[in-house]
Structure formats: C-alpha cells, structure tokens
C-alpha cells in the first residue's frame, strides 16, 4: 500500500485547511489508526489528533474544537482532517502516519501555508500643481503573506518604484507612482493593482488625478467694433479662462468705477444700452487657489452722431 | 488503458428490477471503487451511490431503499440493482471509477439508456 | 437541504474568447468539488477535482479555482473542441449532488 497526501497544503487565512492522507491499500488490509502530528524542528512532535477505526476521532486538548474529519460518505481509507480556522500559527509541518495490518505503518509529511491576504491602502500625495517637476502622484501600501505584488494601471505618464519591508510572518509592500504634473491629467484614473494568491482576483483602488492650474485669461466680445455704438442692446464681454480649482472671476474699469447699469454675473460683463459713457479701459481678473490672471481690453463706443469720431484699434493685454 | 463496459437491459417493465454489469479493465477494484450516476431526459446528473475499493457501500438517500451495488474483484465487475422502477427512472445509467483524490470520477462507462415502459 | 447552484445555465461564446462558470453551495465544502465536461451523446469527462487540480490530460487552458461556498471554472482561449456541457459536482456530505449544468454553445 502507499500513502496519497499532498506535499504542500495552502490555506487562506480564516479558512479551514484540508489536510489529506489517504491510504490505498488491498481490501484486506485494516487500517487501526491514522495518527496526525505537527512536527516542529524547535519543539519536536506535537500530538494533533487521533482516528480509531473502533474508537472515533479523538482530538488533543491544544486542537479542540479545531480538528474534524469530514462527514459520511468516507473511503473507511480516507485519513483526512480538517483544521478549522486556520491561522499563521499554524503554518509548518504535519505528518499523517497511517497503521494499518498486516503491512505495518506508513507515514507522510505535508506543509501547510497560510495565505494572508492583503488589505491595500491608497494615500494621495501632495497637491499637485502644473509647472512642478517629478513629484509624487500617490502611494499604496499592501501588507500580506507571501509578499504581495503592487502594481499601477493608468494611461498617465509616470514612473512606478517599489520597497518592500519583511516582518516576521509578513512582507509589506509599498510601491509609490511618481509624475510630472500637466493640467490634462486632470480627472484621469490612476489604480493601484494588488495581485496576491490568496486573492480571488486582484484588489483595484482608483485615485483620480487632480492638477491644479490656471489658464492665461482673454476678453471675447470686442471682435468687431463696429458693433459698439450708441443704443446698442445686450452688449457683453466675456472673461475667457480655464482653471483647476474652478476660478473666479471679477470686472473692473481702470480708470473709475465701472459706469451704473453695467452688470457683472460671473465671468460676463452686461452693459445697458450703449452710450458714449461706456467707453474705457475694463480688466477681467481671474484667481483660484493656486494663482491669478488678468487681461484689459479698451472700449470705445461709437456716437453715429458725432461722424467726425473715428474708431480706435482695440488693444488687449 | 482504463476501461468500464457497462451491459444491461434497454427496457424495464413499471414495477421490474434494473440490473447493469459494469466491467472493468486497466485498473483494480481492490485500488479504485467505483460510483453510479444517472441522467434523465433534458435534465442534469444525479449521484446514486458508490462502492468503495474495501466492499463497503453509501448510498444516496432517495435511492437506499430499493439499491443495491456490489463487486467481484476477482472477476473485475461491479454489479447494479434497483428494484421497483417506475416511468421518471428512465435514464442513462453511468458506472464511474473513482479518482486519484478518493472522490471524483475520472473514467465513466458508455452509459446504459433505460426506458421504463410497458 | 443541501443545494449547489450553478450559473450561468447557459452561455455563448466565440473560439479564442475567456469564459467562467460558477457553483455555489449551500455551505462550506472544503474544496471538496470536481468539475466534469459533457459532449452531446457521450459520457461525461473529468476536468478538475479538489476544486483546483487538473484531471490528467486536461489542457492548461482549463483552470478551477475558488474555496468555502463559491468556486469557478475558468477557460482561456476558448476551443472549438471545449463547446458543451459543463457540471460541477461536490464531495462533502450525502447526497453528492451536481449543479444543474452551463451549456456552452459557439457564437
């Protein structure tokens, strides 16, 4: 007869660990007892438990409430246990030695690893700003049994680095993504990928990319200056500008308050009916959190009136 | 290598005994039990029982009362028997070695197709 | 009762694509699990058993996986030669029951 068992045993922590030995044997053969033992080098054999083909299963006090067979239907060859809930404590050695009459005793060894899945953790970097150079986009940290492998999926350009820490039982894994910031990586995914064995299928942590910038700031409305005269109804400027936080916007007249009736709703500028006292100097000014922006145009209002009035090249800054 | 021959009747009587002769080669009895599955008509595969490589029997419990599964292993047979059949045991009959894992079944025989009709 | 689900009940699939197939059991079966393969008029076939070893001469393209209540067939790069019909089956407690079956026809 021979001893069937498996020579490595892997178990996710928390789960319950199938450790096989079955004897296949000739019919008339009796198998008495399987005896299971954890074998440690420092503390020798441990005693886990007992079947009696008579008696039933017997468990050591260590392994109470830990240790049972499989139920019925059972090969009356079939020598397996179950240790319930396994933990990293009980990774090592296991011997099944199977007496059997009239061939005597045959014995086998298996290891038993206990998969600790990781738990990743995403921590962003610093705020990123354009017009930084190489700086970090974020971390991820994934500690498990055996090491875990942590990877990024992006369509951004980056560079990735890993360190990896040993713990006794453990390996921690932390691979950081490194990028130099630019305003179209704004919203953009960058996941964090954990590969592990004792995961079904790898864990994703997404972080979406936030770039903070501001656009230089350009005046729309003033594109053809004839349109500019006296009487004219619902002319407006508009305050051109991108930014990441979203900016504000503001108005003001360089040379006096801005004239009464001439409204400001964001980044607009609503005059009345044109009048000759609408003519000036208006700057646009835009500011977020990171910086500000200002741009002025020159307003000239035509009088049909007054024809020896000539139109003035609009210039903008 | 490892063959199971399966002879047995196409047609029961309601009421009649089933018995299938499932004989094999390229293997031991005395090494691999043997189990016995059907399928009936458009359904799936249902599990009947096992005998194991020592002699020794489980049976599927809607089935204990009226089956029996023995062997001769000299003769490298295992022997099927169901007694009082009716219409919805109309089936394809399989006999199957048991696996390397104690378990599982890694060769089927042909399959016997039963009509139970009168 | 004891009950093992298996999904979907049928599927369809091109040559070269991935599929997976699923079983769900009622309780904890400790891998005790085997996947079997089924071509129309024929015997079925073993594919896995313990829930992740492969049956000899099974090609690698075939993969089992999972533990406790959920486990999966996998197979990559669909062949002409894997459309049928696939069972699971579980070894824990009487009666040994299979899942009701995914029939995998070519697209």
């Known amino acids: 007869g021979e001893l069937e068992t498996s020579d490595l045993v892997t178990v996710v922590l928390g789960q319950d660990a199938k450790l096989p030995c079955f004897y296949r044997g000739d019919p008339d053969e009796q198998v008495g007892q399987v005896a299971w033992a954890r074998v440690d080098p420092n503390e020798g054999t441990r005693e886990l438990a007992l079947l009696h083909s008579k008696y039933g299963l017997h468990v050591s006090p260590a392994y109470e409430d830990r240790v049972e067979q499989p139920p019925p239907p059972r090969d009356p060859l079939d020598g397996s246990i179950l240790l319930r809930n396994a933990v990293q404590a009980d990774e090592g050695e296991y011997e099944c030695r199977v007496s059997t009459f009239p061939a005597g005793s045959f014995q086998a060894r298996m290891r038993l690893r206990v998969l600790v899945p990781p738990l990743p953790s995403l921590n962003p970097g610093p705020p990123l700003e354009e017009g930084q150079g190489l700086t970090l986009a974020a971390s991820c940290t994934a500690e498990g049994s055996p090491a875990p492998s942590v990877t990024w999926d992006t369509e951004v350009k980056g560079t990735q680095s890993s360190r990896s820490f040993k713990h006794s039982r453990s390996a921690a894994v932390t691979s950081e993504f490194h990028l130099v910031p630019s305003r179209s990586m704004n919203g953009q995914p960058l996941t964090c990928v954990v590969s592990h064995p004792g995961l079904l299928q790898d864990q994703r942590i997404t972080h979406t990319l936030q770039v903070a910038f501001l656009a230089e700031a350009s005046v729309r409305g003033l594109e053809d200056q004839n349109l500019w005269h006296v009487g004219r109804e619902g002319a407006t400027l508009k305050c051109l500008s991108e930014g990441q936080p979203p900016p504000k916007y503001n108005w003001t007249r360089l040379d006096g308050p801005l004239p009464s009736g001439v409204r400001v709703k964001g980044d607009t500028l609503g005059f009345p009916p044109l009048t000759t006292e609408h003519s000036g100097v208006y700057v646009c000014h835009v500011s977020n959190e990171l910086s500000s922006r200002a741009s002025q145009v020159t307003v000239e209002v035509l009088d049909p009136e007054d024809p020896g009035k000539q139109v003035d090249l609009v210039s903008a800054s | 290598q490892v063959q199971l021959k399966q002879s047995g009747p196409n047609l029961v009587q309601p009421s009649q005994s089933l018995s299938i002769t499932c004989t094999v080669s390229?293997?031991?009895?005395?090494?691999?039990?043997a189990h016995w599955v059907r399928q009936s008509p458009g359904k799936g595969l249902e599990w009947l029982g096992v005998?194991?490589?020592?002699?020794?029997?489980d049976y599927n419990a809607a089935f204990m009362s009226r089956l029996s599964i023995t062997k001769d292993n000299s003769k490298s047979q295992v022997f099927f028997k169901m007694n009082s059949l009716q219409a919805d045991d109309t089936a394809i009959y399989y006999c199957?070695?048991?696996?390397?894992?104690?378990?599982?079944?890694?060769?089927w025989g042909q399959g016997t197709s039963v009509t139970v009709s009168s | 009762d004891f009950q093992v689900t298996q999904s979907p009940a049928s599927l369809s699939a091109s040559v070269g694509e991935t599929v997976t197939i699923t079983c769900r059991t009622s309780?904890?079966?400790?891998?005790?699990l085997a996947w079997y393969q089924q071509k129309q008029g024929k015997s079925p076939q073993l594919l896995v058993y313990?829930?992740?070893t492969l049956a000899d001469g099974v090609p690698s393209r075939f993969s089992g996986s999972g533990s406790g209540t959920q486990y999966s067939l996998k197979i990559n790069s669909l062949q002409p030669e894997d459309f049928g019909t696939y069972y699971c089956?579980?070894?824990?407690?009487?009666?040994?029951?299979f899942g009701g079956g995914t029939k995998l026809e070519i697209k």
């Open positions: 199957a070695k048991i696996g390397y894992d104690g378990y599982a079944m890694d060769n």
């Open positions: 390229g293997f031991s009895l005395t090494t691999y039990g």
């Open positions: 005998i194991w490589r020592g002699g020794s029997t």
């Open positions: 309780e904890n079966i400790h891998n005790y």
């Open positions: 313990n829930a992740k």
């Open positions: 089956q579980h070894f824990w407690s009487s009666p040994w029951t």
